[in-house]
């Protein structure tokens, strides 16, 4: 807490400028009017104040706005934003995307801090959903943002926002997240033609069910192995050898290199060796000829 001391004669700040960097902490406290600071916040970021001096300026703003800063001040916080605690940020009502961008810019290139996480949470909750412009902004600053959300939070993403998602934004998503995003992507891209549709939906296919994979296999899509390896195992298992061959097209040869890894390994165990042999890849581990295949899951469903 900075002690209240009178401002020395001639040192009263008439504007926020570089002369203030040579003020001691107590002089800043005594000589800078909080209302002046609030109206000239846009200047603060350009002035080389120390962390300690920024603490004094923050303290002045806290006294002026005990219920939380107005957006006109928040938008110009600049580096002072990094001095805010999540508790401070929870008092704010940030509605402008420009304000969000300005604060994210301060943190650009760094991992998401607790302050940024709180800011984003406040902003998204205030908007009620993750609209396209917001998602565009957030993924531009934090490509992993989408995958940091819970499946429940992702359910508030409208299909129209999916257009803002880039393949790299989904790199760290797990299957539960893709389960939520895939139906939204399918809906968003439904009016596109075959090849264009596949380009857009490809990144989301980790959430695709078997029937959609079967449908894709009829469209000459030539799925690459990297995408195939990210598919849900339970969605791949029911596919026939012919369907996988059509799905992968020329990339089918890559199955040999992946035969020990999921989902390829599990899929091989479910296929007849005869059928696997038709691929000419030397895949081993299929069901030997003459063996009867019992679908236990179907048997359980009937009993």
């Amino acid at each position: 807490e900075v002690e209240k001391t009178a401002c020395p004669s001639g040192k009263k700040a008439r504007e926020i400028d570089e002369s203030l960097i040579f003020y001691k902490k107590w002089e800043l406290e005594a000589c800078v009017d909080a209302a002046l600071l609030a109206t000239q916040m846009d200047r603060v970021n350009a002035i080389p104040f120390t962390y300690e001096q920024l603490d004094v300026l923050k303290h002045k703003l806290d006294e002026l706005y005990p219920q939380g800063y107005p957006e006109s001040v928040i938008q110009h916080l600049g580096y002072l934003f990094l001095k805010m605690s999540p508790e401070d940020i929870r008092k704010w009502n940030v509605t402008s995307l420009e304000t969000l961008k300005a604060l994210l810019e301060v943190n650009k290139g760094h991992e998401m801090s607790p302050q940024v996480a709180t800011l984003i949470d406040r902003f998204v909750k205030g908007r009620g959903q993750l609209d396209k412009d917001t998602l565009d902004t957030l993924t531009a600053f934090y490509p992993g943002y989408l995958c940091s959300l819970s499946p429940e939070e992702l359910s508030s993403v409208p299909p129209s926002s999916i257009w803002a998602v880039r393949p790299q934004d989904l790199d760290t998503c797990d299957p539960r997240q893709l389960d939520v995003l895939y139906p939204k992507a399918r809906l968003a891209f439904q009016n596109m033609n075959g090849s264009e549709y596949f380009v857009k939906i490809q990144s989301f296919l980790g959430g695709a069910p078997t029937e959609d994979l079967k449908a894709l296999s009829q469209q000459n899509v030539s799925m690459d192995l990297a995408t195939f390896m990210k598919l849900r195992t339970d969605a791949v298992l029911p596919l026939t050898v012919a369907e996988v061959q059509k799905l992968l097209g020329p990339h089918v040869e890559g199955l040999k290199a992946e035969e020990r890894h999921r989902p390829v390994r599990d899929w091989i165990l479910r296929q007849r060796q005869d059928d696997l042999d038709t691929l000419g890849l030397g895949l081993q581990g299929g069901i030997p000829n003459g063996y009867l295949v019992l679908d236990l899951s179907m048997q359980e469903a009937l009993s």
Epitope: I21, F22, P48, T50, Y51, E52, Y79, G109, S113, P114
Partner: antibody
Framework: QVQLVESGGGLVKPGGSLRLSCAAS????????MSWIRQTPGKCLEWVSY????????YYVDSVKGRFTISRDNAKNSLYLQMNSLRAEDTAVYYC??????????WGQGTLVTVSS | EIQMTQSPSSVSASVGDRVTITCRAS??????LAWYQQKPGKAPKLLIY???GLQSGVPSRFSGSGSGTDFTLTISSLQPEDFATYYC?????????FGCGTKVEIK
């Protein structure tokens, strides 16, 4: 007076790990941001990482992201740098410094880290 | 990131001389510049902050000036203890970056 004393340097093989420590005294450690800065054999200085006074904000230079971890223990007036997957190019004298944002106003004496097979 | 270029890389001078070292930033940094002195085997020591602010305890013969991209460190009358390497550093944008030093040697 302000004093910063680094320790933990030494010779390590590529891929190895080291943990550097910095003991602070003479000022209220918990009030200050702290940084690690290194000086390569060519004598150039390179900022490595910083941590805010509470430890809630942490930044790294791109070349060490995912390999180095900065931390602090305000109760012990200590700053740490955990260095994993070390490379030959990490060879340097490592300094801890008090970070006042506009400059690094106090530095330790440094600890030498040599990464070589 | 912002590149800091110091010139000259070394300078030979005598006690009593006026010595000027320059530092150029690859883009404008306002007055977010610091100067440090380093002697062999020792840690760097802060001399100047915010381009022209003299750090407490530093002799007044040291002064800094400049703004934007071009900065100068001046030693008005070189003393025997001033023979050292001097570094500039920008704090305007992340990450902080340093010049590679100017060595002040005895002529």
């Amino acid at each position: 007076q302000v004093q910063l004393v680094e320790s933990g340097g030494g010779l390590v093989k590529p891929g190895g790990s080291l943990r550097l420590s910095c003991a602070a005294s003479g000022f209220t450690f918990s009030d200050h941001y702290m940084s690690w800065i290194r000086q390569t054999p060519g004598k150039c200085l390179e900022w490595v990482s910083y941590i805010s006074s509470s430890g809630s904000t942490i930044y790294y230079v791109d070349s060490v992201k995912g390999r180095f971890t900065i931390s602090r223990d305000n109760a012990k007036n200590s700053l740490y740098l955990q260095m994993n997957s070390l490379r030959a190019e990490d060879t340097a004298v490592y300094y801890c410094a008090r970070d006042v944002r506009t400059a690094f106003d106090y530095w330790g004496q440094g600890t030498l880290v040599t990464v070589s097979s | 990131e912002i590149q800091m270029t110091q010139s000259p890389s070394s300078v030979s001078a005598s006690v009593g001389d006026r010595v000027t070292i320059t530092c150029r930033a690859s883009q404008g940094i306002s007055s977010w510049l610091a100067w440090y002195q380093q002697k062999p085997g020792k840690a760097p020591k802060l001399l100047i902050y915010a381009a022209s602010g003299l750090q407490s305890g530093v002799p007044s013969r040291f002064s800094g000036s400049g703004s934007g991209t071009d900065f100068t460190l001046t030693i008005s009358s070189l003393q025997p203890e001033d023979f050292a390497t001097y570094y500039c550093q920008q704090a305007n944008s992340f990450p902080p970056t340093f010049g590679c030093g100017t060595k002040v040697e005895i002529k």
